[in-house]
Every structure is written in structure tokens, then in C-alpha cells.
Amino acid sequence: HNTTVFQGVEGQSLQVSCPYDSMKHWGRRKAWCRQLGEKGPCQRVVSTHNLWLLSFLRRRNGSTAITDDTLGGTLTITLRNLQPHDAGFYQCQSLHGSEADTLRKVLVEVLADPLDHRDAGDLWVPGESESFEDAHVEHSISRSLLEGEIPFPPTS
């Protein structure tokens, strides 16, 4: 699996999407887990509804929510109020029994809030025609890691 990078802005929401073959993973619950080190386990953060038929219902664990479009084959994870400590490697998983198949490997990168400047001259204020919500769009800039890029750089 290649790793897909999703970038979000600190304090805002980040939406991660994981496409999959809906027939191949028919009837399977899904999960979002955080990779603990290169060879470490993937620690479950949140999983879809216990009843697969209700997978479309949003389930939440803290600031992380998950929902599954089982017909379209897209698992969506939303990280609210993104913080620097949310940065790291994650996996979208398809569950069967005690098995967990990786649907997508994800690297979440947290960018500094461009509005969070001490210099008031740099502060951007929404115009009259723009709502406050418009200023907090859900950022989801994604790319795949380039060949040769190391997902887990060796630590000294």
C-alpha cells in the first residue's frame, strides 16, 4: 500500500476518505486506527456501527468521527479541531472476524493556522458576503508519498 498524505489546518476539520471495492468488502465493518511506529500495532481509534447495515450512521470517539458509504465504497473519517498531536500515520481498515485488512495507509499532516498571527496586520477577516462557516472549510489536501519518500524516517 502506498501512503496518502492528507493535510489539514490546525483548529479546523480534516476529512479523510478511503475508497474501497464495495463488493469485496461487503458486510465488513470498518475502522480507523493510528499506527504506533513503523512495526508497531495499529491502535483502534474508532470503528463503524456494530450492525453493518447501519454503517452510514456517524460514530464518534472524541474529536474523530467515522461513517461508511457501503454501496459507494467510501469510508470517511473526520478529524475535528485538528491539533499538532493528531499528525502521524493512520490506516483505514476493513474488519472480518479477528482480521483487519488495510484499505489505505494515511499520513495526516497538520499545518499551522495561517490566521493565527500575532501581527494584526496579517489577520484575515471574512468580508460581509462571507459567512463564518466559509472561513472554516474542511481542508483535505491529499497526495501520495513520492517514490523514495520514507513514511517512517529512521530516528537517530
Epitope: 471495492d21 463488493m23 468488502h25 461487503w26 458486510g27 453493518w52 474488519l95 472476524g97 479477528s98 482480521e99
Partner: antibody, heavy 123, light 107 residues
Framework: EVQLVQSGAEVKKPGESLKISCKGS????????IAWVRQMPGKGLEWMGI????????RYSPSFQGQVTISADKSISTAYLQWSSLKASDTAVYFC????????????????WGQGTLVTVSS | DIQMTQSPSSVSASVGDRVTITCRAS??????LAWYQQKPGKAPKLLIY???SLQVGVPLRFSGSGSGTDFTLTISSLQPEDFATYYC?????????FGQGTKLEIK
Amino acid sequence: EVQLVQSGAEVKKPGESLKISCKGSGHSFTNYWIAWVRQMPGKGLEWMGIIYPGDSDTRYSPSFQGQVTISADKSISTAYLQWSSLKASDTAVYFCARQRTFYYDSSGYFDYWGQGTLVTVSS
Amino acid sequence: DIQMTQSPSSVSASVGDRVTITCRASQGISNWLAWYQQKPGKAPKLLIYAASSLQVGVPLRFSGSGSGTDFTLTISSLQPEDFATYYCQQADSFPRNFGQGTKLEIK
């Protein structure tokens, strides 16, 4: 009607190669996992491995990893089991089976089976 | 690998008898278990899935129970066509191993 039709019996010599087939009909072959199961003479069932023809995702039992190759051609709804160098101990009946899919749950159970292919390896 | 152990390996019974076959998994598999019937020269036939659900078309005299590591297949009243070999199979993880089989013979 769902059917899995396997290729006919084979008699081979040790060291020869072989590829047997399992053709599906009456269902969307691409969307079902297909397993291979071995039954040696007078013995029980042994799960060898499984393939999803849609993307050729394949899983092997550690006992058979490196001993056989499982493949599929979704364009002709056919799964294959092959050996590059047969041994006398490969003499067995080989079954293909479709993994059942429930409307509400995932599954690892096999609801439709081929009739079996007898492979005899003898010098 | 999860190993499946069936007992007994063979059992003799008469038409009308109640017969129970057990299957034990080497580790917990929740209810991810199937039972198959196989007659000589034929392919196996799915009887029970999810430990206790009866496959469509299977007679009601067949029933399954259990969860975790211990499972049973019960035939409430043996019929002549039930004499065959029975296998359990775990579906919790790969490889999806079968038990070694239980041969049900006429007494």
C-alpha cells in the same frame, strides 16, 4: 443457477507442471472470493488459499505458500490452481469453492463447490 | 493458525438416534464457524454457518451451537441419508482451517 465447473482429472509425473481450472457461472464471479481446498486420498479437507477475482487479491495457507499459485481471469470467470513442479504427495482431489456473501454480514463460509479435480502424480 | 479439533473422529449410530459432534478451536473465534457434510466422491455441502444458522434447504433436524472455542453440531433424529463425514471450519481468520472430520457410520 450458480455453478462452479472444474477441469477434468489429470495424471502427471513428478516434476511436471500443471494448471487446473474452476469456471463460475450463474453469479457475478468477479465479486466473490474463490477458495481452493485439498483432499488427499482418505483424508480430510485442507484449506489452501483464496482469491478475489476482482483485483486478484490472494491469501495462502502457510502450509501451501510457495508450493502452489492461485490466480484468476475475471474476463472468463475462471480461477486457477497451478504447480510448477509436482510431487507424488500432491496426489489428491482439489475443490474450488465460492465464499458466501450475506446481505448483512461478511463471511468466510463456502456455499457452492466445484465437483473436484483428481490429480494423480506418479512415476 | 487457528487449529480445529473435532471429536469423536468416528461415531456409530442408528436411524432415529440423536447424535452430537463437537469442534474445538485453539483460540476464540466468536461465532465464526461452519459445519459441512461430505459424502464419498462428492463435494462438501454447507449445513450451518455463523455457528448456529441453518443454510437454506438444510433439514431442521440439523442444528449448531456454541461460541468462542467450543461448538457442537447436533442431528436430532438420524436419517439414512445423514451417514457421511462432517467437518467444522473456522471463518475468523486466514487460513480458514477445517477440523479433521467426524465419520458418522451406521451401527
